[in-house]
């Protein structure tokens, strides 16, 4: 008879997740030689074991937390950009600009990036059927609850001037629903965060609007500012001359309006 | 085959500095990170210092941090320890080593001996 | 006191088998490899396991490492004299951004 399995709302497992977080956990190690130490096979089991047998509607942040013991790289502090809605072009950019980071080019980060993962009560067994979905189904999922633990962490080792790319097509640059909104806003330390510098960029070629002055950006300055860190803003008007500049800084046709 | 020769160390009073160099060959000595391991008479192994490869980053033990700085000449082959400040708890055989791809030491130079002493 | 834990001494007669064992943390050996030397006085300490149970060429199979959670083992089959030796497990420490040793082990064979 087979066994009666919970369907989630939302995707499976990813195929191939044990192999995939481990392959990724070897690769890292190998283009970070400071990281070159880590044990991925433990790092695996202690990944696993987050959510493992465990309900994936009832997941904490302490069922993290042994994973987290190994979240002790050392980014440098002043070096953090954190994005919302515009993944891929902080990506691209911390790519080119290889002494900032974002969380997904912190180990744990990298690991994860785009994976989704979750288990069944009782079993050892992975779910690769459904898993979870924030909003149809619970909010304490697996993946959710990684994201949130590593961006909280993330956001608190932050200093000086911590950089945030904004999606400036989307209806809300400012979404307080985000995991930016959310989460790092709030764990950004007043105490050794002197300014949140946000980045706007662009989607229209023609578009020339001052996207600071949107109003959930006016909101975002006024979260900051009463949580005693300075706010700046900056429109990227183009975000493929931004990168081109990003790439060669002494081209002529980089000027401060990009 | 490699080889890794250390020198430099004698006899310095508390206080005073000493400069150890290790030469290194029969391997690509850019390629590598390097440590300083120490071993104080009757004590046990006691990693000091380590540098990278490329543009170097340097990690240092808690009990040497601030007094000593690890250094690089990657067209000599040569890996340096500078030690300033150095107290009666310095004394040790000082080795260099070669860190391997997952960060064990797998070569080591016979040591050389530095004795802090009034 | 050694951030990693080994017993001072351990011994056995010739082709007995020896266990030398090293406790540490999460910090340690949890997440990071472990590493075993082998140090005979007047000679360069030599690496005998790396990445927990590795040998590197030239180290005879007798030598056999292991790991569990946060605490590792070296193991020497068909002991003989030329073991006789101070053994020390390393590992890299998240907390201390470095490398640690355990106090080291004195093998005598009997």
């Known amino acids: 008879v087979p066994r009666w399995r919970q369907q989630w709302s939302g995707p499976g497992t990813t195929k191939r997740f044990p192999e995939t977080v481990l392959a990724r956990c070897v690769k890292y190690t190998e283009i970070h030689p400071e990281m070159r130490h880590v044990d991925c096979q433990s790092v695996w089991d202690a990944f696993k074991g987050a959510f493992i047998s465990k309900h994936p509607c009832n997941i904490t942040e302490e069922d993290y937390q042994p994973l987290m013991k190994l979240g002790t790289q050392t980014v440098p502090c002043n070096k953090i950009l954190l994005w919302s809605r515009i993944k891929d072009l902080a990506h691209q950019f911390t790519q080119v600009q290889r002494d900032m980071f974002t969380l997904e080019d912190t180990l744990l980060g990298y690991l994860a990036d785009d994976l989704t993962w979750c288990g069944e009560f009782n079993t050892s067994k992975i779910n690769y059927q459904s898993c979870p979905d924030w909003r149809k189904d619970c909010s304490n999922n697996p993946v959710s609850v990684f994201w949130k633990t590593v961006s909280r962490r993330f956001a608190e080792a932050a200093c000086d001037v911590v950089h945030v790319m904004l999606n400036g097509s989307r209806s809300k640059i400012f979404d307080k629903n985000s995991t930016f909104g959310s989460v790092e806003v709030h764990n950004l330390q007043p105490e050794k965060v002197q300014t949140l510098e946000a980045w706007v960029i662009h989607g229209g070629r023609e578009d020339s609007r001052d996207l600071c002055q949107d109003p959930t950006i006016k909101e975002l300055e006024s979260i900051i500012s009463k949580r005693n860190i300075q706010f700046s803003c900056k429109n990227i008007y183009r975000p493929d001359k931004f990168l081109q500049c990003v790439k060669n800084p002494e081209d002529s046709s980089c000027t401060s309006e990009i | 085959q490699v080889q890794l020769v250390e020198s430099g160390g004698g006899l310095v009073k508390p206080g005073g500095s000493l400069r150890l160099s290790c030469a290194a060959s029969?391997?690509?000595?850019?390629?590598?990170?390097m440590s300083w391991i120490r071993q104080a008479p009757g004590k046990g192994l006691e990693w000091v210092a380590s540098?990278?490869?490329?543009?170097?980053?340097?990690y240092y033990a808690d009990s040497v941090r601030g007094r000593f700085t690890i250094s690089r000449d990657n067209a000599k082959n040569s890996l340096y320890l500078q030690m300033n400040s150095l107290r009666a708890e310095d004394t040790a055989v000082y080795y260099c080593?070669?860190?391997?791809?997952?960060?064990?030491?797998?070569?080591w130079g016979q040591g050389t001996l530095v004795t802090v002493s009034s | 006191q050694s951030v990693l834990t080994q017993p001072p001494s351990a011994s056995g007669t010739s082709g007995q088998r020896v266990t030398i064992s090293c406790s540490g943390s999460?910090?340690?050996?949890?997440?990071?490899?472990v590493y075993w030397y082998q140090h005979l006085p007047g000679t360069a300490p030599k690496l005998l396991i790396y990445?927990?149970?590795q040998r590197p060429s030239g180290v005879p199979d007798r030598f056999s490492g292991s790991k569990s959670g946060n605490s590792a083992s070296l193991a020497i089959s068909g002991l003989r004299s030329e073991d006789e030796a101070d053994y020390y497990c390393?590992?890299?420490?998240?907390?201390?951004?470095?490398?640690?040793f355990g106090s080291g082990t004195k093998v005598t064979v009997l």
């Open positions: 080593a070669r860190e391997g791809w997952s960060g064990e030491f797998t070569d």
């Open positions: 029969g391997f690509t000595f850019s390629d590598d990170y």
């Open positions: 540098v990278s490869n490329g543009r170097p980053t340097t």
């Open positions: 999460s910090s340690n050996i949890g997440f990071h490899f």
């Open positions: 990445k927990n149970n």
């Open positions: 390393a590992a890299w420490d998240d907390s201390l951004s470095g490398y640690v």
